[in-house]
Interface confidence: low
């Protein structure tokens, strides 16, 4: 016997969907209706039958009621080939919901998102996660994309994209936007950061993480950041190979005074990289390649320490107190 | 060996106030997120607030607006004022805390307190 595709929790609180059958009974996905996370995995299938089943430019009015009643807080929707118009009938309808943390992975989108017909109201999402999404419309897709949400995004992540670099003049700012997660994107490089970052659209970030970018330096990110107008509250470069030393022929970077909390974790260095910011409250350098403990001078004016995982602190070593390096 | 010790929790009245107080001790090196969890019988434990060592908070939707918390690095304390008490707000709230310390070796991991109840009855 084949499992059931869908598995509701106890609590009613989170759904997960596993449909790998070719021909999948979409139907039970309804005994998700009562739960606040839900999972759909679609198992790689392609969608575009689905066009053929549904309106997709029905007036999403016609279910307002329905939708709204549902408690989905949570979605996720991964492993399908998904037509545009598709998935934006999705999001018209899901414009009435009380949707605010929506997860897209393993997504391959068909087709060009038609423009937001001037009735329709956009998805009041405070997060968009997006994994191995790719798009048609290459480095347009987010500024597609954006349209159909309500100008109050707070969360944006986006990991293995095939178009990490977006069209910056068609994209429009995110005012609310405090944490932009670019991690897992390996080929970015700090020139495709610059392009990533597109100049003034990202007025409010706080927290910028940059996980496994192919960062080289800090300095060579403070430049790209500097160029953009981001100055993020905490900046997290864990996992980038970051080489210690600066270019002498490279101009020196200002860090913006609101950077407070660094994170160098993993990042293979054997000695504190040179062009750190002045002062900071958090350096995180744990798990890296240090031989020695840092002396003072090599070390920004900091308050939390972290140093745990590095060579030189084998056992009987002390571990620095945070501010005791000042 | 790491605790963490909470306090201010007790008996209040709807719309009125408790500040809640939750301090680490131990061998103590780093302290990095804390934050306010809060259970209520046979429910899961919930988010209520968290603060990183920088200050930015996170709060659940339900407590936006009546609840702030903050922390004192130097004391490795975290706080939750709670205004606008009401019934829904009654629970066993829990203190949670990431921290770098020192027993045999250098260590990082969460630690939760044991909870002081909060009851919201007229």
């Known amino acids: 016997t084949t499992p059931e595709p869908c598995e509701l929790d106890d609590e009613d609180f989170r759904c997960v969907c596993n449909f790998s059958e070719p021909q999948p009974d979409w139907s039970e996905a309804f005994q998700c209706v009562s739960a606040v996370e839900v999972e759909i995995h679609a198992g790689g299938l392609n969608l575009e039958p689905f066009l053929k089943r549904v309106d997709a430019d029905a007036d999403p009015r016609q279910y307002a009621d329905t939708v709204k009643a549902l408690r989905v807080r949570r979605l996720t929707v991964g492993a399908a080939q998904v037509p545009a118009q598709l998935l934006v009938g999705a999001l018209r309808v899901l414009a009435y919901s009380r949707l605010k943390e929506l997860t897209l992975e393993d997504l391959k989108i068909t087709g060009t998102m038609p423009p937001l017909p001037l009735e329709a109201t956009g998805l009041a999402l405070s997060s968009l996660r997006l994994r191995n999404v790719s798009w048609a419309t290459g480095r347009s897709w987010l500024a597609e994309l954006q349209q159909w949400l309500k100008p109050g995004l707070k969360v944006l992540s986006i990991a293995q994209a095939h178009s990490p670099a977006f069209s910056c003049e068609q994209v429009r700012a995110f005012p609310a936007l405090t944490s932009l997660d670019l991690s897992d994107n390996p080929g970015l490089g700090e020139r495709g950061l610059m392009a990533a970052l597109c100049p003034h659209k990202f007025p409010a970030i706080q927290n910028l993480a940059l996980r496994n970018t192919g960062m080289e330096t800090p300095t060579g990110v403070c430049a790209a950041l500097a160029a953009a107008g981001v100055q993020p509250h905490s900046l997290d470069l864990s996992h980038n190979s970051l080489r210690a030393t600066v270019n002498p022929s490279a101009p020196r970077c200002m860090w913006s005074s609101a950077l407070n909390s660094l994170n160098l974790s993993f990042a293979g260095l054997e000695q504190v990289p040179k062009g750190l910011p002045a002062k900071l409250r958090v350096l995180d350098l744990s798990c890296n390649r240090l031989n020695r403990a840092p002396q003072p001078d090599e070390l920004p004016e900091v308050d939390n320490l972290t140093l745990d995982g590095n060579p030189f602190l084998v056992p009987g070593t002390a571990l620095p107190h945070e501010g005791s390096m000042n | 060996q790491v605790q963490l010790q909470e306090s201010g929790g007790g008996l209040v009245q709807p719309g009125g106030s408790l500040r809640l107080s939750c301090v680490a001790s131990g061998n103590i090196r780093s302290v990095g997120d804390m934050g306010w969890y809060r259970q209520t019988l046979g429910d899961q434990r919930e988010m209520v607030a968290t603060?990183?060592?920088?200050?930015?908070?996170r709060y659940a939707d339900a407590v936006k607006g009546r609840f702030t918390i903050s922390r004192d690095n130097a004391k490795s304390a975290v706080y939750l004022q709670m205004n606008s008490l009401n019934r829904e707000d009654t629970a066993v709230y829990y203190c949670n805390a990431d921290i770098l310390y020192k027993s045999d070796s250098y260590a990082r991991r969460e630690f939760w307190g044991q909870g002081t109840q909060v009851t919201v009855s007229s």
């Open positions: 603060i990183d060592y920088g200050g930015v908070a």
